[in-house]
């Protein structure tokens, strides 16, 4: 459970009517759109012994509900109808039996909003807490995903990228992780809250951007992360290049990094030759693989595709469906708005492709 | 102090129904439950029911399960019992009591009591 | 339903006697007992809860003993005021009952 989704505890202390009856929950709860909170909550009403052999039920219910007529937003009484907009998502965790009435809301949303107020039932006995009320309130996502780039991007050699929402709570329903980018790729394992690219750079990838987006389908709710691709080719020992860019979108290099031009004419025109060849050939692949799907159990492939405006074509691979239920949070982070990798050639300098395409992986 | 007060008495026909009012003052009217009991002429004490302060449905006697209809009205702190389908042992005493819960075991469970009572509404079925 | 028997349904003695009204349950109620006395015109009032406990300002000469099923109310040395019906209820299970009740007379 992260940990600022439970704000300080507003204890609302025991009703100021009789000492026989109480409920203590924090008066106020704020949690963000798409993610969870659990909310402790403790009461205690009298029961007297004619009513020992009954069943304790709890319910949640909006403010303003009339028994009678309507629907809790929660309960442990399984023959008891929920109400749909929170079925699913909102349930009483706590056992009532136990006098706790803790409540749990996943997926939130923004139409959660508002108070609640806690029932007991057990036989005869049966009592609604209207004071304390427990107060939610559902801001803006603004967690946003991190992106894990070990090492630096060669070209030609795989790396694998980790998109992960370590805040993201293990018991909502799993995000959906969709990967944008320009360089050949591939999907890699996934967890609940975490997705692997495999990326293979090319050297035209460098500076291109590469978008991870998490969707929070249960509340409809989406927050991505940008990068900068920064495709060194480096000969010698390589080194980690992993930049917090400051949004400006120019390409930074590494001092010290960048060496010699290789000398002659014959040789950069050798190297000119080849280096057209290998573009053509790999566009030609690249072109043939946004015909085929790269992603597994290809499922959704009309589901629009994400950002950047300026892509002329995406690519879909459809959503990889998980049961597991262990989040791995990576170590390393990106965490500026817009990151660079530097990317620096040695003695060559890397085509521009003007109509870059970009392929979109989408996992789930 | 706690006190109970109750309707007048009603005169009703076989087939009719009756309604009767306990009016709370005196305590915390929402933290108490409130129970029905009657007592035909000469007879004993008869339980017929319990209702939440907090509303919800209450628990009825099951002989008198869909005839009786116990509400309470938290704006004027009164309960009423509604009794239809009246027939001659319909005739009795009806009483509300207060029923308070004395601190219980270590289950939490507790003892009942009716530690005050309404004065009491005579109903007579008559044709 | 737990049944509740008093029997007998009435009783008297003198003034200063010694009074003991039995109360029997159909099942073990766990000495979840009260005692009520109700006077003639008048609403019952509580005088002894949870088999033995005696209620605020209820005279010391009365008493109450049992368990299981088998339960008395005992008056110590009855007092003219003391003429009234004495019901014993058991709160062990709903639907609550209560017995028929002891009608104690002055000789």
């Known amino acids: 459970m992260p940990l600022l989704l439970l704000l300080p505890l507003l204890w609302a202390g025991a009703l100021a009517m009789d000492p026989n009856f109480w409920l203590q929950v924090q008066e106020s709860v704020t949690v963000q759109e798409g993610l969870c909170v659990l909310v402790p909550c403790t009461f205690f009403h009298p029961i007297p012994y004619y009513d020992k052999n009954s069943p304790v039920h709890g319910y949640w219910f909006r403010e303003g509900a009339i028994i009678s007529r309507d629907s809790p937003v929660a309960t442990n009484k399984l023959d008891q109808e929920v109400q749909e907009e929170t079925q699913g998502r909102f349930r009483l965790l706590g056992d009532p039996s136990r006098n706790n009435c803790s409540l749990s809301i996943v997926d939130a949303r923004r139409r959660d909003n508002g108070s609640y107020f806690f029932r007991m039932e057990r036989g005869s006995t049966k009592y609604s807490y209207k004071s304390p009320q427990l107060s939610v309130h559902v801001t803006d996502l603004t967690h946003r995903p991190k992106i894990l780039i070990p090492g630096t991007l060669e070209p030609g050699h795989s790396k694998n990228l980790t998109c992960s929402v370590s805040w993201a709570c293990e018991q909502g329903t799993p995000p959906i992780f969709s990967w944008l980018s320009a360089a050949p790729t591939s999907l890699g394992p996934r967890t609940t809250h975490s997705s692997v690219l495999i990326i293979t750079p090319r050297p035209q990838d460098h500076g291109t951007n590469l978008t991870c987006q998490v969707k929070f389908a249960g509340a409809g709710v989406t927050t991505e992360r940008t990068i900068q691709l920064n495709v060194t080719y480096v000969p010698q020992n390589p080194t980690t290049g992993i930049f917090p860019g400051d949004g400006s979108g120019k390409q930074e290099t590494r001092a010290g990094v960048v060496h010699g031009a290789i000398g002659g004419a014959g040789v950069t025109a050798l190297l000119a030759l080849c280096l057209c060849l290998i573009f053509f050939i790999v566009k030609t692949h690249r072109r043939k693989a946004a015909r085929t799907a790269v992603g597994r159990n290809d499922t959704h492939p009309t589901t629009g595709s994400a950002s950047p405006k300026h892509q002329k074509k995406s690519k879909l691979h459809g959503p990889t469906e998980t049961s597991s239920c262990s989040g791995a949070a990576p170590t390393v982070e990106m965490d500026e708005e817009l990151h660079y990798a530097s990317l620096n050639f040695h003695g060559m300098n890397p085509s521009k492709d003007t109509s870059t395409e970009y392929s979109e992986v989408r996992t789930q | 102090q706690v006190q109970l007060v109750q309707s007048g008495a009603e005169v009703k026909k076989p087939g009719a129904s009756v309604r009767v009012s306990c009016k709370a003052s005196?305590?915390?009217?929402?933290?108490?439950?409130v129970h029905w009991v009657r007592q035909a002429p000469g007879q004993g004490l008869e339980w017929m029911g319990i209702?939440?302060?907090?509303?919800?449905?209450?628990t009825y006697a099951q002989r008198l399960q869909g005839r009786v209809t116990m509400t309470r009205d938290l704006s004027t702190s009164t309960v009423y019992m509604e009794l239809s389908s009246l027939t001659s042992e319909d005739t009795a005493v009806y009483f509300c009591?207060?029923?308070?819960?004395?601190?219980?075991?270590?289950?939490?469970?507790?003892?009942?009591?009716?530690?005050?009572w309404g004065q009491g509404t005579l109903v007579t079925v008559s044709s | 339903d737990i049944r509740m028997t008093q029997s007998p349904p009435s009783l008297s003695a003198s003034v200063g006697d010694r009074v003991t009204i039995p109360c029997q349950a159909s099942?073990?109620?766990?000495?979840?007992l009260n005692w009520y006395q109700q006077k003639p015109g008048k609403a019952p009032q509580l005088l002894i809860y949870?088999?033995?406990n005696l209620e605020i300002g209820v005279p010391s000469r009365f008493s109450g003993s049992g368990s299981g099923t088998d339960f008395t109310l005992t008056i110590s040395s009855l007092q003219p005021e003391d003429i009234a019906t004495y019901y014993c209820?058991?709160?062990?299970?709903?639907?609550?009952?209560f017995g028929g009740g002891t009608k104690v007379e002055i000789k």
């Open positions: 009591a207060r029923e308070s819960r004395l601190r219980g075991n270590r289950l939490g469970l507790q003892s009942s009591i009716f530690d005050h």
């Open positions: 005196g305590y915390i009217f929402t933290n108490y439950y």
């Open positions: 209702i939440s302060p907090s509303g919800g449905s209450p």
């Open positions: 099942q073990d109620i766990n000495n979840h």
């Open positions: 949870d088999t033995s």
């Open positions: 209820q058991q709160y062990e299970n709903l639907p609550l009952t």
